[in-house]
Structures are given as structure tokens and as C-alpha cells.
């Protein structure tokens, strides 16, 4: 039962994270939550950084600055892969949740 619950939590978190991405950066509250998660957990996107390509409000050569290894204003514009966190947040935060929840 614990595993089923955990999988359900992960699935919900994945869906919720992707939903929040769709609202980025239009919704300031959403943006600050996502930015905080990406910066704190050193991750980018849901599965990985390429998820940001699919967000209509984001230019295809851009990720949020919070994805950068060294966060500075504009660092996500025309990004180079070596300068950003490539791992997805669902797996990264999910691992933390599994250990701590």
C-alpha cells in the first residue's frame, strides 16, 4: 500500500509540476515556486531541461535562469548545456520525497 501511495504522489507531483511549467512565467507566484525548486534542487524541467522547449511562452533557446549552475540575470537565454542543470526535477525531488516523506 505504501508503494502505491508513493507512486500516486509521484504521479501527482509530475502532473502538477508540468502544469505549473505551462503557466511560467506569466504567473508570478507559480514562477517563484518553480524557480525556488529548480534552484534548491539543482534541477531543470520535469523530466529534464528539454521540457522547457515545449512551453509556448518560452523561447526555444531559453530556460529559466533558475536552471543555471551559476544563477545570474539572463543566464538562461541562449543557454549552453554545460552551464545548466540537466537533470529533471520530478526525479530529483521525487528521490528526496521518497527518503524524507
Amino acid at each position: 500500500a505504501g508503494y502505491v501511495f508513493r507512486d500516486k504522489v509521484m504521479s501527482e507531483f509530475n502532473n502538477n509540476f508540468r502544469q505549473q511549467m505551462e503557466n511560467y512565467p506569466k504567473n508570478n507566484h507559480t514562477a517563484s515556486i518553480l524557480d525556488r525548486m529548480q534552484a534548491d534542487f539543482k534541477c531543470c524541467g520535469a523530466a529534464n531541461y528539454t521540457d522547457w522547449e515545449k512551453i509556448p511562452s518560452m523561447s526555444k533557446n531559453r530556460v529559466p535562469d533558475s536552471c543555471c549552475i551559476n544563477v545570474t540575470v539572463g543566464c538562461g537565454i541562449n543557454f549552453n548545456e554545460k552551464a545548466i542543470h540537466k537533470e529533471g526535477c520530478v526525479e530529483k525531488i521525487g528521490g528526496w520525497l521518497r527518503k524524507n516523506v
Epitope: S59, F79, E81, K82
Partner: antibody, heavy 119, light 108 residues
Framework: QVQLVESGGGLVKPGGSLRLSCAAS????????MNWIRQAPGKGLEWVSY????????YYADSVKGRFTISRDNAKASLYLQMSSLKAEDTAVYYC????????????WGQGTTVTVSS | DIQMTQSPSSLSASVGDRVTITCRAS??????LNWYQQKPGKAPKLLIY???SLQSGVPSRFSGSGSGTDFTLTISSLQPEDFATYYC??????????FGQGTRLEIK
């Protein structure tokens, strides 16, 4: 020294195929995005395609979409452009170009290889 | 797509002249603007990146300025080797990477 050397250009009939190669040396290939940029005779510069460090991200100009395929072999420090269904308007010098991205410009260009599409 | 428009298309000048080439973007590109020089039969060469930063090895007579939509490339005192074609290019929003149509600088 830092170098990009293109090869594979030549004369091809309309509808034909060609594969361009670019050998990189003198730098860490995986640190860079790579581009193909072309220049038709007497014309300006036209971006064709780019590929990310890992090869996860690739994009094409509308004029070549569905006909050209960009790829890279990081172990061989090589960039490729597979061109098919070639048209007369694809006739150009094709340059392999290194791109550090961010706010830096495209800082290293190959010497170019000429592709001529004619019957 | 962001369009880049250069002016003039061609320009005649003499050695020692001060020359300015302009580039206009169809929307704001912040400072994500680069300038290249191309001589006949040769590959382009990066001169200026980020609108105003001089690429290593480029003579200091070359300078760039501007941000947003309007940019300029200035050659303070033309040398014989500066006669070439110059292109601007934006990297703010890609794909596509877009270039200006070029400015041909000729000897008067």
C-alpha cells in the same frame, strides 16, 4: 590550434543526396553547440541548423526542414549534415561553425565546403 | 522570427575614414547582437559579441554599441584590410538564428 575542417561537398543532381562532415580539433567539442550556416553565390549568410552539446536539441531552418538532418559524434569530435531531396537553391558554401552560446558570438568557422546542385 | 535589417547595403570610403554601419532588429534583442567581417572567398570572422565586446585579436579601431533594437558597428580609422562585407546577427531568440543582409564596404 582550434580548427574546423569541412568535407563532403560536390556536384549533385536535383533530388540527390550528400553528406557533409566537419572534423573539430584543438578544443573540447562537447563544450559547444554546433551550427551549419550556408552562403549561396553572391548572397548573404543563412543559418541552416544547430545541434546542442549532447545532441539532445536540434533545429532546422524552414527551408531545409524534413530534407536535412544534423548529427554529431562526440567521441570523434565530428559534426555531420545529411542532405537529401536537394534543390538548385541549396547550392552554396556550407560552413561548420562553433557556438559557445549565451551572449558570445559564433567564434570559430570552418573554411567551408561547396555544394552545387545542378542537372 | 526576428528580422535584422542593416544599413547601408553598400558603402564607399577611404583609408583613414570613420565608418558607421547600423543594424536594426524587428523586436528587442537586449544585447544579444554579434558582428562579423567577411572577405571574398573566406569564412566570416567574429568581430564583436554582446553588442559591444571586442573579440580577442580584433583591432581596437572596431567598436560596437546599442541595445534593444538599434545597434552600430564603428570603424574609427579605416585600414586597407577593413574593406570587406559586414554582417550583424542576433542570438536572443532562436531558432532561427538570423543575420542582417550584409553591408559591403568598398574603397572610394
Amino acid at each position: 590550434q582550434v580548427q574546423l575542417v569541412e568535407s563532403g561537398g560536390g556536384l549533385v543532381k536535383p533530388g540527390g543526396s550528400l553528406r557533409l562532415s566537419c572534423a573539430a580539433s584543438g578544443f573540447i567539442f562537447t563544450d559547444y553547440f554546433m551550427n551549419w550556416i550556408r552562403q549561396a553565390p553572391g548572397k548573404g549568410l543563412e543559418w541552416v541548423s544547430y545541434i546542442s552539446n549532447s545532441g539532445n536539441i536540434l533545429y532546422y531552418a524552414d527551408s531545409v526542414k524534413g530534407r536535412f538532418t544534423i548529427s554529431r559524434d562526440n567521441a570523434k569530435a565530428s559534426l555531420y549534415l545529411q542532405m537529401s531531396s536537394l534543390k538548385a537553391e541549396d547550392t552554396a558554401v556550407y560552413y561548420c561553425v562553433r557556438d559557445p552560446r549565451m551572449f558570445y558570438g559564433m567564434d570559430v568557422w570552418g573554411q567551408g565546403t561547396t555544394v552545387t546542385v545542378s542537372s | 522570427d526576428i528580422q535584422m535589417t542593416q544599413s547601408p547595403s553598400s558603402l564607399s570610403a577611404s583609408v583613414g575614414d570613420r565608418v558607421t554601419i547600423t543594424c536594426r532588429a524587428s523586436q528587442s534583442i537586449s544585447s544579444y547582437l554579434n558582428w562579423y567581417q567577411q572577405k571574398p572567398g573566406k569564412a566570416p570572422k567574429l568581430l564583436i559579441y554582446a553588442a559591444s565586446s571586442l573579440q580577442s585579436g580584433v583591432p581596437s579601431r572596431f567598436s560596437g554599441s546599442g541595445s534593444g533594437t538599434d545597434f552600430t558597428l564603428t570603424i574609427s580609422s579605416l585600414q586597407p584590410e577593413d574593406f570587406a562585407t559586414y554582417y550583424c546577427q542576433q542570438s536572443y531568440s532562436t531558432p532561427p538564428i538570423t543575420f542582417g543582409q550584409g553591408t559591403r564596404l568598398e574603397i572610394k
